[in-house]
Interface confidence: low
């Protein structure tokens, strides 16, 4: 089975603009690609299956996404702990200032289209 987690965080040193509302724009696609790459670095263990539903919101930039793991490989607390441990590295590797991290379980069944 698969476990899903909803993750939200702020990037306080990036500016939100209207191009982040349009998935076809270069800014949206670049930010999406770089954040995806960052999560592959954070959750390197075999249980991480990927992420989906990346959304950007105003408030500097608020990032919302869903993480998928093999069932039983990680819990909400560990998802949040690993992400928080990575914040310093995110600052150095990606020049990101991350704050207001929030993680919650996504109730099953999960629709990738939602």
């Amino acid at each position: 089975g698969v476990s899903f987690f909803f993750l939200s965080f702020h990037i306080s040193n990036l500016q939100f603009n209207s191009s982040l509302e349009d998935p076809s724009t270069d800014y949206y696609q670049e930010l999406q690609r770089d954040i995806s790459e960052m999560f592959l670095q954070i959750y390197k263990q075999g249980g991480f299956l990927g992420l989906s539903n990346i959304k950007f919101r105003p408030g500097s930039v608020v990032v919302q996404l869903t993480l998928a793991f093999r069932e039983g490989t990680i819990n909400v607390h560990d998802v949040e702990t690993q992400f928080n441990q990575y914040k310093t590295e995110a600052a150095s590797r990606y020049n990101l200032t991350i704050s207001d991290v929030s993680v919650s379980d996504v109730p099953f069944p999960f629709s990738a289209q939602s």
Epitope: D34, E89, A91, S92, Y94, N95
Partner: antibody, heavy 123, light 111 residues
Framework: EVQLVQSGAEVKKPGASVKVSCKAS????????IEWVRQRPGQGLEWMGE????????NYNEKFKGRVTFTADTSTNTVYMELSSLRSEDTAVYYC????????????????WGQGTTVTVSS | DIVMTQSPATLSLSPGERATLSCRAS??????????IHWYQQKPGQAPKLLIY???NLETGIPARFSGSGSRTDFTLTISSLEPEDVAVYYC?????????FGGGTKVEIK
């Protein structure tokens, strides 16, 4: 003052291993990556990999994977680079360097370097 | 791997002349608006020394005659007025993707 002091020159035979140390001082050791870079005689710079002392997390250049191992001793603020199965092409100066930030914490780069350790591989 | 190509291989100029060194990446080294490229100076028998970080930021203590510019794949290190002590090899480094890669270097010499 940030300083990285490396161990002395080594002469090794082909097939042997070498272990180079890099002792850090003048900054908080745990949260900064240490990079390893080598320079063969008359050649350019080549990134070998890195270690984050606080966690022991490593990233290796695939070219050296399986032959190189980085370790860190947080009690002595020392990082080690061990290269095995040495061959003549491994004759080089090996540098450790800190991947650090400026005083405002705003930017990161490889900012401080050790003096280099010359490793000679010869039969 | 990202390939970093520096040109020219050697630059021979008179004191006071402007030196322009180029570094080209095989793919973008920009991430979230930051160009993860750095410039180093290496003199014979010495370790490299950081001059410019993130493409255009002058490292503390480096003379203002050094400057960096460029974005994504094309970068330039400029020495506005060459001094005899600037004789060295200059390297660019990308820290965008592992493995990090250096350019082959540009040797700057005085005519």
């Amino acid at each position: 003052e940030v300083q990285l002091v490396q161990s002395g020159a080594e002469v090794k035979k082909p097939g042997a291993s070498v272990k180079v140390s890099c002792k850090a001082s003048g900054y908080r050791f745990i949260p900064y990556w240490i990079e390893w870079v080598r320079q063969r005689p008359g050649q350019g710079l080549e990134w070998m990999g890195e270690i984050l002392p606080g966690t022991g997390r490593t990233n290796y250049n695939e070219k050296f994977k399986g032959r190189v191992t980085f370790t860190a001793d947080t009690s002595t603020n020392t990082v080690y680079m061990e290269l095995s199965s040495l061959r003549s092409e491994d004759t080089a100066v090996y540098y450790c360097a800190r991947y650090g930030d400026d005083t405002s914490g705003g930017y990161y780069a490889v900012d401080y370097w050790g003096q280099g350790t010359t490793v000679t591989v010869s039969s | 791997d990202i390939v970093m190509t520096q040109s020219p291989a050697t630059l021979s100029l008179s004191p006071g002349e402007r030196a322009t060194l180029s570094c080209r990446a095989s793919e973008s080294v920009n991430i979230l608006g930051t160009n993860l490229i750095h410039w180093y100076q290496q003199k014979p028998g010495q370790a490299p020394k950081l001059l410019i970080y993130h493409a255009s930021n002058l490292e503390t203590g480096i003379p203002a005659r050094f400057s960096g510019s460029g974005s994504r794949t094309d970068f330039t290190l400029t020495i506005s007025s060459l001094e005899p002590e600037d004789v060295a090899v200059y390297y660019c480094l990308q820290s965008r993707k592992i493995p990090w890669t250096f350019g082959g270097g540009t040797k700057v010499e005085i005519k």
